[in-house]
């Protein structure tokens, strides 16, 4: 099947990193300075995409494979392929339209990306706050106020196994 | 060999809004930016804006307020949207595959007339 | 952004002589490693425009040899060194450093 495709299209026996040139009889030429192909057959080589700007380059161009782009430092990547890049902020800060901008009172961000996220309402799993939230931290729920009377036990109960095969999520 | 195709009306009454369509095919619409760029009539190439599959938008800042682009990648399209138009947006408008988000235009489309007139 | 300046605008040759266009940047396109984020395109009568060279000098696979790209920082220049009846149409030059892209104004390369 091989030999008989490549009777039919002398270009199928191009390998990767070249293409074939239609200016030379379609012979294989390699791939021009800064361009690539990662599959055999092809008749034009793709030009590799530059890390410009906020992007830099995490793995340079070969002739058989494009480019890849991270961020410079300050930033962070968006999207598959690093496809933009957004400014970092601060823990305790969100990233808005008009820049980085502290969490309002009663949200948290423990990151340099994100949103601020509302603190944990303790009071809904029937536990009290046992450390505070702050703009970068969520509160530490802790026992609920019964566990805390007198005469209870302060000693929790052990936690249940978990099932082989499942990481916590 | 990636080839893309334009589509959308023809004609388009003042302050409604331009839909076009850019169908890709040969290739995959993963891993590339694709980029809108127009040609009003004897006049020259003004880039519009690029999507990156992953759907991130950048406009040229001459348009912003009034351009949308879109992707479909279960399609292999990408579309553009133009509101409140006017005769200055009559053109040929191109989709064109952009190896760097910005740069290099190694394929477009054939391009398609769209006048904007009463 | 950054303003693109072609000459000439129109450029008559005859067939089987050499061509040059010229461009220039309002701020340097060199980055990092010596490139130069240009790109020169040739609009055919009635056609797309096609890629030609990338990064300032480098052909695109399938263009032609007599085609070539030199220049770095503000000032570039696209050299055909022998013309031919299908070269002639609209060549522009464009920068890829920033967004937006843009543009030279074009020029038009006609057979005399």
């Known amino acids: 099947f091989e030999r008989t495709r490549s009777l039919q299209d002398p270009c199928s026996n191009c390998p990767a990193g070249t293409f074939c040139d239609n200016n030379r009889n379609q012979i294989c030429s390699p791939c021009p300075p800064n361009s690539f192909s990662s599959a055999g057959g092809q008749r034009t080589c793709d030009i590799c995409r530059q890390c410009k700007g906020v992007f830099r380059t995490r793995k340079e161009c070969s002739s058989t494979s494009n480019a890849e782009c991270d961020c410079t430092p300050g930033f962070h990547c968006l999207g598959a392929g690093c496809s933009m890049c957004e400014q970092d902020c601060k823990q305790g800060q969100e990233l808005t339209k008009k820049g980085c901008k502290d969490c309002c009172f009663g949200t948290f961000n423990d990151q340099k990306r994100g949103i601020c996220r509302p603190w944990t309402n303790c009071s809904l799993d029937g536990k009290s706050v046992l450390v505070n939230g702050t703009k970068e931290r969520d509160v530490v729920c802790g026992p609920s106020p019964a566990d805390l009377s007198p005469g209870a036990s302060s000693v929790t109960p052990p936690a249940p196994a978990r099932e082989p095969g499942h990481s916590p999520q | 060999q990636v080839q893309l195709q334009e589509s959308g009306p023809g004609l388009v009454k003042p302050s409604e809004t331009l839909s076009l369509t850019c169908t890709v095919s040969?290739?995959?619409?993963?891993?590339?930016?694709w980029s809108w760029i127009r040609q009003p009539p004897g006049k020259g190439l003004e880039w519009m804006g690029y999507?990156?599959?992953?759907?991130?938008?950048q406009y040229n800042p001459s348009l912003k307020s009034r351009v949308t682009i879109s992707v479909d990648t279960s399609k292999n399209q990408f579309s553009l949207k133009l509101s409140s138009v006017t005769a200055a947006d009559t053109a040929v408008y191109y989709c064109a595959r952009d190896q760097s988000g910005g740069g290099s235009f190694q394929h477009w489309g054939q391009g398609t007339l769209v006048t904007v007139s009463s | 952004e950054i303003v693109m300046t072609q000459s000439p605008l129109s450029l008559p040759v005859t067939p089987g002589e050499p061509a040059s266009i010229s461009c220039r940047s309002s701020?340097?396109?060199?980055?990092?490693?010596?490139?130069?984020?240009l790109d020169w395109y040739l609009q055919k009568p009635g056609q797309s425009p096609q890629l030609l060279i990338y990064?300032?000098?480098n052909r695109a696979s399938g263009v032609p040899d007599r085609f070539s790209g030199s220049g770095s920082g503000t000032d570039f220049t696209l050299k055909i060194s022998r013309v031919e009846a299908e070269d002639v149409g609209v060549y522009y030059c464009m920068q890829a450093l920033q967004t937006p892209p843009t543009f030279g104004q074009g020029t038009k390369l006609e057979i005399k």
């Open positions: 999507i990156y599959y992953s759907g991130s938008t």
């Open positions: 701020q340097s396109l060199l980055y990092s490693q010596g490139y130069n984020h």
């Open positions: 040969g290739g995959s619409i993963s891993s590339y930016y």
């Open positions: 990064g300032g000098s």
